[in-house]
């Protein structure tokens, strides 16, 4: 027989919300990915001492991870909605190869890494619908990505651990900057 509602005090229910707007959905999707990154970072930091390492610069030189710069129009000073949106989408597309690299880097969190990768693909789709100037978005070259992936996978264990840590940290920072910028749009 059906259990009457409210019988179990540990049930978690939220109020009935109105339909999500496009902006709300993007905002929530970014926060969803950030939550997933936290889970991956937790495993990385537990597994190695990379999170406290001061030798990051050595590995960072080999990586060309997307970063927000003043010219991208995403900061409060010199904010430009269209330029910034193009930067966010382009940056996310550039991060995809690094998220692919993460797929084989987690023993106990294989599905977690996959979830972060797939939820990022969904975010890119949401943002592409929002963008008016899709022509300005450059898609990374698949051949270049393939050779980058091979190069990253050929690194020694220490560098692979450092690369994993840097990707997660940079991706988190990029998403946080994107979230702040999108809230101004």
């Amino acid at each position: 027989a059906p259990v009457p509602p409210g019988e179990d005090s540990k049930d978690v229910a939220a109020p009935h919300r109105q339909p999500l707007t496009s902006s709300e959905r993007i905002d929530k999707q970014i926060r969803y990915i950030l939550d997933g990154i936290s889970a991956l970072r937790k495993e990385t930091c537990n597994k190695s001492n990379m999170c406290e390492s001061s030798k990051e610069a050595l590995a960072e030189n080999n990586l060309n991870l997307p970063k927000m710069a003043e010219k991208d129009g995403c900061f409060q000073s010199g904010f430009n909605e269209e330029t910034c949106l193009v930067k966010i989408i382009t940056g996310l597309l550039e991060f995809e190869v690094y998220l692919e690299y993460l797929q084989n880097r987690f023993e106990s969190s294989e599905e977690q890494a996959r979830a972060v990768q797939m939820s990022t693909k969904v975010l890119i789709q949401f943002l592409q619908k929002k963008a008016k100037n899709l022509d300005a978005i450059t898609t990374p070259d698949p051949t270049t990505n393939a050779s980058l992936l091979t190069k990253l996978q050929a690194q020694n264990q220490w560098l692979q651990d450092m690369t994993t840590h840097l990707i997660l940290r940079s991706f988190k920072e990029f998403l946080q900057s994107s979230l702040r910028a999108l809230r101004q749009m």
């Epitope: 978690v12 229910a13 939220a14 109020p15 009935h16 919300r17 999500l20 959905r25 929530k28 999707q29 926060r31 969803y32 990915i33 939550d35 997933g36 936290s38 889970a39 106990s108 969190s109 294989e110 599905e111 977690q112 996959r114 979830a115 972060v116 797939m118 939820s119 693909k121 969904v122 975010l123």
Partner: nanobody, 129 residues
Framework: QVKLEESGGGLVQAGGSLRLSCVVS????????IAWFRQAPGKEREFVTT??????????????YYADSVRGRFTISRNDAKNTVFLQMSSLKPEDTAVYYC????????????????WGQGTQVTVSS
């Protein structure tokens, strides 16, 4: 291996209520999205409602979304201790008759069946007039 199992379906009169349950086992990622979909005979599978879950305490945890056709009549909730998601259905109408499925994904705020990776077998709900 992720597994979902629904229960609680049955035959009910229009205006009545039912509470469906979905037990989730084997999930290894967080956050996650659990949704209820339904499929009436000869129709496409359609989204009913979703709830976000997280192993960390974030403000997304417990966030819900409903299809227009059920908003105000159906309520989704979950009990983490029992790894169970509930669908409380009230003021049922004959057009609510369908097989109800629960599904899980790690893709986020997605509301179409093809975005869901894991599915239960479904439970039949029949509303008579």
């Amino acid at each position: 291996q992720v597994k979902l199992e629904e229960s609680g379906g049955g035959l009910v009169q229009a205006g009545g209520s039912l509470r469906l349950s979905c037990v989730v086992s084997g999930r290894t990622f967080s956050p996650y999205t659990i949704a209820w979909f339904r499929q009436a005979p000869g129709k496409e599978r359609e989204f009913v409602t979703t709830i976000i879950g997280s192993d960390r305490s974030t403000d997304l945890d417990g966030d819900t979304y409903y299809a227009d056709s059920v908003r105000g009549r159906f309520t989704i909730s979950r009990n983490d201790a029992k790894n169970t998601v509930f669908l409380q259905m009230s003021s049922l109408k004959p057009e609510d008759t369908a097989v109800y499925y629960c599904a899980l994904t790690g893709k986020g705020y997605v509301f179409t069946p093809n975005e869901y990776d894991y599915w239960g077998q479904g439970t039949q709900v029949t509303v008579s007039s």
